[in-house]
Interface confidence: low
């Protein structure tokens, strides 16, 4: 038998029944992937003195195409499967007639989740087995039982990864807006140790669980105009993979150790989120690695502290949001949080108190977006494959699929006056809905900048006239010279730089001479070689956690915990005057040129780390040879 | 080339506070760490603090940890430290140093600014 949750009980809650409403009566074939639940369901819930009237949609969206779940089978063999028929309960939504009103529920065995109406936020958990129209609870956060948590990254590190914190640097937006930018994407992967899956007993229940978790981090961060996607589900239903310690920062390295280990074989991921069902020392119940988002860093861990899986959910919004570059609502003066101050505190307030948040605040926001102006967070610009969503396009999701030409979510979250949020087609007269060339639902002239240059291996970007979206970025031609370095996919590697990523503000490049060993596995043997473009050897500093470390004379090189393979000098690195690491090896950098590219751009472009031409301003690909106006006056009007 | 010169140096009484600058010119596109040094009477120069200046990441040496505060204002091309609750340890003439990207040293130095705490 599964140990019992040590899960705190509810203070005070009112006893509902929830009543669903008859849904449209329309008689026609259903596709077989809409499965036991309906696309959208309506319940109507008495509580607080008020009839609440939730209206519900499947999050279709929940799962990416790949998805995958990987456990460990009866034979003690490790199994990584698609499951089929992946029909699911998990649902997002808002409150009739409440205009800034959330809701995100499952509906598998009666109704669980929060809606939230204005500044109260509901939760809604079965009484009895007697499922949809059975008793429910509805209550607040604050009168679940529990002690307060708070996170585990500390102000100091987090003052050193962001930066000076001014209360200038807020400039609230209207509280109703969504960022105007494109919708960005977190493919999440998630791990569920041993003692979380012991907990609650099944990989069926720890499923459900981890699937409700991320429908409402997904709802919360939808006002960002994220989607939070899970692409891959990892029960340890036999042992942990890693040690999972009490203290969340040893678990957070082990976490991230593990992971690179793990990269190779399993999903490519944009993060990884470990639901602990450990303990962790003292109030903490989540810790993170700030601004780490799309790197070989991003992750957190989080301890799953209440019997309501909105508390986890709100954890790992948290800590996802650290990921993302964001500060603790306290470090930052006249940071703004909407949230009534009875109701609670904003998601990224250091410690959750008594009740669980629904909102970012003003300065999260404006976090984020310096975050997003990263050449880094690239990673969050792919949505995941539309054609493969599971369950299909449906209009209201912020994906624009196959059959719409906008999507700026639900009527009652939309406001993008360029699209008909309830066909997903623009409105009338308008040319386009979303998109940096996007502007008064017309695409913008030709020639006009939508994304500068962001450093000397960059390339800014210019509206192309006949498109809402901003060309693709592209970035200097490989092998033009950059600070210490020559230009290599739009970064500048140095072995200097490369040092302090991994060994702090302190790693430097050692010695010349270390670069001579060749280390073989198990740190034992040496052998000569030629170059710098063997293994990354690297002095001063401080030993990145749960690496292990191979030293010869002064040289430390970074290796994996068996010592079988040692962190490389990437590809690109500069190892001598015009020479780069290219395939292992120190080479000229003609290995990056086959021709003379910026030839053919007739002195109006020059040539990008492709090998093709990038334009001028108001000049046309693929050769910078015409003007736009011209191109375009010869091939007719906008498609 | 990059040029560092500091100010803000002096004569205090412990548990005072003082603030350095460092303001570079030249090449200052070309740096990737700033730091702090100092230099007390009959020791070798330690490090106190460096910041890396295009992300801004921070580290200190475990005897300033929570007084000193290192800060930089890339538009003026100058980097600070804030020290607070000075101890007569602290005396020693403070170097800013700057390390650019194709160096793993701190190749340029400024003249130097000296700190005095007294008891």
């Known amino acids: 038998i599964a140990p019992s949750r040590p899960w705190a009980l509810m203070e005070q809650y009112e006893v509902v029944l929830p009543w669903r409403l008859p849904g449209p009566r329309v008689r026609r074939a259903l596709p077989s992937h809409l499965g036991l639940h309906p696309e959208r369901v309506s319940y109507v819930l008495g509580a607080t003195g008020h009839n609440f009237t939730l209206h519900l949609r499947k999050n279709r969206d929940l799962l990416g195409s790949g998805y995958t779940e990987t456990y460990t089978a009866a034979n003690g063999s490790e199994v990584t499967e698609q499951p089929r028929g992946q029909d699911h309960c998990f649902y997002q939504g808002h409150v009739e007639g409440y205009p800034d009103s959330a809701a995100s529920l499952s509906t598998c065995a009666g109704l669980r989740g929060f809606f939230q109406v204005g500044s109260d936020l509901h939760l809604i958990e079965p009484l009895d087995e007697g499922g949809e129209g059975g008793r429910h609870a509805v209550y607040q956060a604050e009168h679940l039982l529990q002690t307060a948590g708070t996170c585990g990254v500390s102000d100091d590190s987090l003052g050193s990864l962001l930066g000076p914190r001014t209360a200038a640097v807020f400039r609230p937006r209207p509280g109703d807006s969504l960022p105007s930018r494109e919708t960005r994407y977190v493919e999440l992967y998630v791990v569920v140790d041993n003692a979380e899956f012991q907990m609650l007993g099944s990989e069926a229940a720890v499923r459900h669980r981890v699937l409700e978790v991320v429908n409402h981090v997904d709802k919360l961060y939808q006002k960002l105009n994220f989607r939070v996607v899970l692409v891959g589900l990892e029960i340890w239903n036999s042992q942990d993979r890693f040690h999972v310690s009490p203290d969340p920062s040893v678990t957070l390295e082990n976490l991230l150790t593990w992971q690179a280990r793990q990269r190779t074989r399993r999903h490519l991921h944009d993060n990884v989120q470990l639901i602990t069902g450990v303990d962790f020392t003292g109030t903490t119940v989540g810790f993170a690695r700030v601004s780490a988002m799309c790197s070989h860093s991003s992750g957190a861990v989080n301890q799953d502290h209440s019997k309501n899986p909105v508390g986890v959910a709100c954890t790992m919004a948290h800590e996802m949001g650290h990921n993302l570059g964001m500060d603790h609502d306290e470090n930052v003066q006249g940071c703004r949080c909407q949230e009534r101050f009875e109701a609670g505190r904003c998601i990224m307030a250091g410690s959750i108190g008594s009740s669980f948040p629904r909102m970012f605040s003003d300065c999260s926001q404006a976090y984020l977006e310096s975050f997003l102006e990263r050449p880094q967070s690239v990673c969050l610009a792919n949505a995941p494959d539309l054609s493969h969503l599971v369950g299909g396009p449906v209009c209201g999701n912020l994906f624009v699929e196959r059959g719409e030409q906008c999507d700026c979510g639900p009527p009652e979250d939309c406001r993008n006056r360029c699209c008909n949020s309830t066909t997903c087609q623009l409105a009338e007269g308008a040319q386009c809905a979303h998109g940096t060339c996007c502007q008064e639902c017309k695409v913008k002239p030709a020639g006009e900048l939508c994304r500068p240059k962001k450093d000397m291996c960059d390339l800014e970007e210019f509206c192309d006239g006949r498109h809402p979206e901003c060309p693709e970025d592209a970035f200097q031609e490989n092998g033009t010279p950059c600070s210490g370095g020559y230009c290599y996919n739009g970064a500048c590697p140095t072995l200097a730089q490369q040092c302090q990523a991994f060994w702090g503000p302190g790693g430097q490049a050692a010695e010349e001479s270390c670069f001579s060993y060749d280390i073989l596995p198990g740190c034992k043997a040496s052998r000569y070689r030629a170059d710098m473009c063997g293994v990354l050897q690297c002095k001063g500093g401080q030993q990145p956690l749960g690496r292990a470390i191979c030293i010869v004379d002064v040289c430390h090189a970074l290796t994996t915990e068996d010592g079988t393979a040692y962190e490389p000098v990437p590809e690109g690195t500069r190892c001598g005057p015009e020479k780069v690491c290219w395939k292992g090896r120190c080479q000229d950098l003609h290995v990056y040129r086959s021709s003379n590219c910026s030839a053919q751009c007739h002195n109006h472009g020059v040539c990008n780390h492709k090998q093709e031409c990038h334009c001028h301003a108001g000049w046309a690909p693929p050769h910078c040879a015409k003007l736009l106006t011209e191109v375009h006056a010869a091939s007719g009007s906008l498609p | 080339e990059v040029q560092l010169v500091e100010s803000g140096g002096g004569l205090v009484q412990a548990g005072a506070s003082l603030k350095l600058s460092c303001a570079a010119s030249?090449?200052?596109?070309?740096?990737?760490?700033m730091g702090w040094f100092r230099r007390a009477p009959g020791k070798d120069r330690e490090s106190v603090a460096t910041v890396t200046w295009r992300d801004n990441i921070t580290y200190y040496v475990d005897s300033v940890k929570g007084r000193f505060t290192i800060t930089r204002d890339n538009a003026k091309n100058t980097v600070y430290l804030q020290m607070n609750n000075l101890k007569p340890e602290d005396t020693a003439v403070y170097y800013c140093?700057?390390?650019?990207?194709?160096?793993?040293?701190?190749?340029?130095w400024g003249q130097g600014t000296q700190v005095t705490v007294s008891s």
């Open positions: 140093a700057a390390q650019t990207e194709d160096s793993a040293q701190y190749i340029y």
């Open positions: 030249g090449r200052t596109y070309d740096i990737r760490v």
